[in-house]
């Protein structure tokens, strides 16, 4: 399989609502029309799949209905958003891009984005 460069930010801080967004950019060597994007989480040397979507160029990026990910594509860039994150979800989130069509098949794996999630402090009781 042929290798392809994938770039993503080194660090992202999730919002207080547990939402993190980052851009995954790939150096497409040609005009791919079927692209698969997968987000993987690496923590304690364990790798798990967070979400994945296949899209045809020019169409919307669609994840499964119960996915915690949403995204949009523009050229060779994919804007990914992960929702519902909690402090325990802090970890390295790796973007993997596969160019499925036309041949040849290309695979690119980013270095990962370290997402930090801080659970919001509960509101203190007011004595008014």
């Amino acid at each position: 399989c042929k290798a392809m460069h994938v770039a993503q930010p080194a660090v992202v801080l999730a919002s207080s609502r547990g939402i993190a967004s980052f851009v995954c950019e790939y150096a497409s060597p040609g005009k791919a029309t079927e692209v698969r994007v997968t987000v993987l989480r690496q923590a304690d040397s364990q790798v798990t799949e967070v979400c994945a979507a296949t899209y045809m160029m020019g169409n919307e990026l669609t994840f499964l209905d119960d996915s915690i990910c949403t995204g949009t594509s523009s050229g060779n860039q994919v804007n990914l958003t992960i929702q519902g994150l909690r402090a325990m979800d802090t970890g390295l989130y790796i973007c993997k891009v596969e160019l499925m069509y036309p041949p040849p098949y290309y695979l690119g794996i980013g270095n990962g984005t370290q997402i930090y999630v801080i659970d919001p402090e509960p509101c203190p009781d007011s004595d008014f």
């Epitope: 399989c1 079927e34 993987l40 790798v47 993997k96 499925m100 036309p102 098949y105």
Partner: nanobody, 119 residues
Framework: EVQLVESGGGLVQPGGSLRLSCAAS????????AGWYRRQPGKERELVAT???????HYVDSVKGRFTISRDNAKNTVYLQMTTLKPDDTAAYYC?????????????WGKGTQVTVSS
């Protein structure tokens, strides 16, 4: 280790048809780019046809309109329907699956099946 096993080759007369099958020992074909390649006597191995997970198909010019690649994910099998066969189609045909699982790329090959077109 996933294994790909081709079948369906044989001796056929010019103008005849054959259907090659490629069965995978694991359920990787649904996520892979599956393809058929061939090696003709004295030549390099060449791509014949591929099918993507989204069922987009690609054919080398010399087989367009004569060969059809398809897949059955439930059976973990990829097919190559070959019609109007010519002596030039004589070759060993190999099945291939390219893709990745988590951070690991895979590129599996079968051992091949021989197709001979001769009268």
């Amino acid at each position: 280790e996933v294994q790909l096993v081709e079948s369906g080759g044989g001796l056929v007369q010019p103008g005849g048809s054959l259907r090659l099958s490629c069965a995978a020992s694991g359920s990787i074909l649904s996520i892979a780019v599956a393809g058929w390649y061939r090696r003709q006597p004295g030549k390099e191995r060449e791509l014949v046809a591929t099918i993507s997970p989204g069922n987009n198909t690609h054919y080398v010019d010399s087989v367009k309109g004569r060969f059809t690649i398809s897949r059955d994910n439930a059976k973990n099998t990829v097919y190559l329907q070959m019609t109007t066969l010519k002596p030039d189609d004589t070759a060993a045909y190999y099945c291939n699956a390219k893709g990745s699982i988590l951070l690991n790329a895979f590129d599996y090959w079968g051992k091949g099946t021989q197709v001979t077109v001769s009268s």
